[in-house]
Interface confidence: low
């Protein structure tokens, strides 16, 4: 039977923060300033992510891994790998196409990011407000009415502003 | 080694217009942010903004953003800057200079010998 | 943007001996790994030249008699001893954001 021929790929050999290098014969030669190869075998770099304008720099960029950017001061990250910024706004308000509006009547946030939410509905769950809410924080809800008679315990934990396993970026 | 080269001098009318020109060698243009720097006589130093050749990417410094207009040619590895309805506050020395890679952050390595932009009647 | 104020404006010095320019800005300009700040030697009718990189790193070329210290919003250009080349104006400039910008210039005079 014949023999299949394997001739190994001499850019196989060039390690991460290299690339293989056609002009010069294949051989390795090292990433060029502001680019990185973080896998071996590549025949060229990437250029390294650049954190301008609102964007900064969180990890440099090396020859073997991008850069990573946050966001400057009143912004915050959005989107995977921090893709764009985002304004932040004062807790009790939200971002709007007009900028930063405060919450309506019956509605908080206690981040600087994100929408407003409404009052958590203490009736639903069979209690009264013990604490009333504001543009930035939830109502507490405090015991049933029927729970105030005397002997009672006055206050019950209130409930979380948040659903289990919600917390801000 | 690497050069940025630009015209000396140019003399423009008031209310008109002007391209400036930067021809860069020995690096890879594209690879690099070029920005612009305004030097009026005897005094300081501003920063007019930057554009990435790979991706036509700019910034600008709020004051220059009617102003000025960052654009290259990669075939001849050159930066423009065009200045519009210019007045005598315009006249100045125009530098344009390379930046340096580290991160996402640069210092300003390599400089042109800048060209006199003269306003007059 | 960040305002860097650099002092003095001028600043005599006799040969030999050291020259202290500072800058600083108004809000911080450094992490943990680095200072974004950078230093310009500019003399009549010559483009900058860069001396200084991330605060304390000579770019290369540049005499040792040059150096730069500090981190945060202070900065300092020190030069000793002064020899006559010096002659110059010094600039302060900061990447940390756009837009860049620059101190008002330090001219350095021997005396």
């Known amino acids: 039977f014949e023999r299949t021929r394997s001739l190994q790929d001499p850019c196989s050999n060039c390690p991460a923060g290299t690339f293989c290098d056609n002009n010069r014969n294949q051989i390795c030669s090292p990433c060029p300033p502001n680019s990185f190869s973080s896998a071996g075998g590549q025949r060229t770099c990437d250029i390294c992510r650049q954190c301008k304008g609102v964007f900064r720099t969180r990890k440099e960029c090396s020859s073997t891994s991008n850069a990573e950017c946050d966001c400057t001061p009143g912004f915050h990250c959005l989107g995977a790998g921090c893709s764009m910024c985002e304004q932040d706004c004062k807790q009790g308000q939200e971002l709007t196409k007009k900028g930063c509006k405060d919450c309506c009547f019956g509605t908080f946030n206690d981040q600087k990011r994100g929408i407003c939410r409404p009052w958590t509905n203490c009736s639903l769950d069979g209690k009264s407000v013990l604490v009333n809410g504001t543009k930035e924080r939830d109502v507490v809800c405090g015991p049933s009415p029927a729970d105030l008679s005397p002997g009672a315990s006055s206050v019950t934990p209130p409930a979380p502003a948040r659903e289990p396993g919600h917390s801000p970026q | 080694q690497v050069q940025l080269q630009q015209p000396e001098s140019e003399l423009v009318r008031p209310g008109g217009s002007v391209k400036l020109s930067c021809k860069a060698s020995?690096?890879?243009?594209?690879?690099?942010?070029m920005d612009w720097v305004k030097q009026r006589h005897g005094q300081g130093l501003e920063w007019i903004g930057n554009?990435?050749?790979?991706?036509?990417?700019?910034n600008y410094a709020e004051k220059f953003k009617s102003k000025a207009t960052l654009t290259v040619d990669t075939s001849s590895s050159t930066a423009y800057m065009h200045l519009s309805s210019l007045t005598s506050e315009d006249s100045a020395v125009y530098y344009c200079t390379r930046e340096e890679a580290l991160g996402g952050y640069y210092e300003l390595t390599y400089w042109g010998q800048g060209t006199l932009v003269t306003v007059s009647a | 943007d960040i305002v860097l104020t650099q002092s003095p404006a001028s600043l005599p010095v006799s040969l030999g001996q050291r020259a202290t320019i500072s800058c600083r800005a108004s809000q911080s300009v450094s992490t943990s790994s680095y200072s974004y700040m950078h230093w310009y030697q500019q003399k009549p009718g010559q483009p900058p030249k860069l001396l200084i990189k991330y605060a304390s790193n000579l770019e290369s070329g540049v005499p040792a008699r040059f150096s730069g210290s500090g981190s945060g919003t202070d900065f300092t250009l020190n030069i000793h001893p002064v020899e006559e080349e010096d002659t110059a104006t010094y600039y302060c400039?900061?990447?940390?954001?756009?837009?860049?910008?620059f101190g008002g210039g330090t001219k350095l005079e021997i005396e």
């Open positions: 554009i990435y050749p790979d991706s036509g990417g700019t």
């Open positions: 400039q900061h990447s940390w954001e756009i837009p860049y910008t």
């Open positions: 020995g690096y890879t243009f594209t690879s690099y942010w």
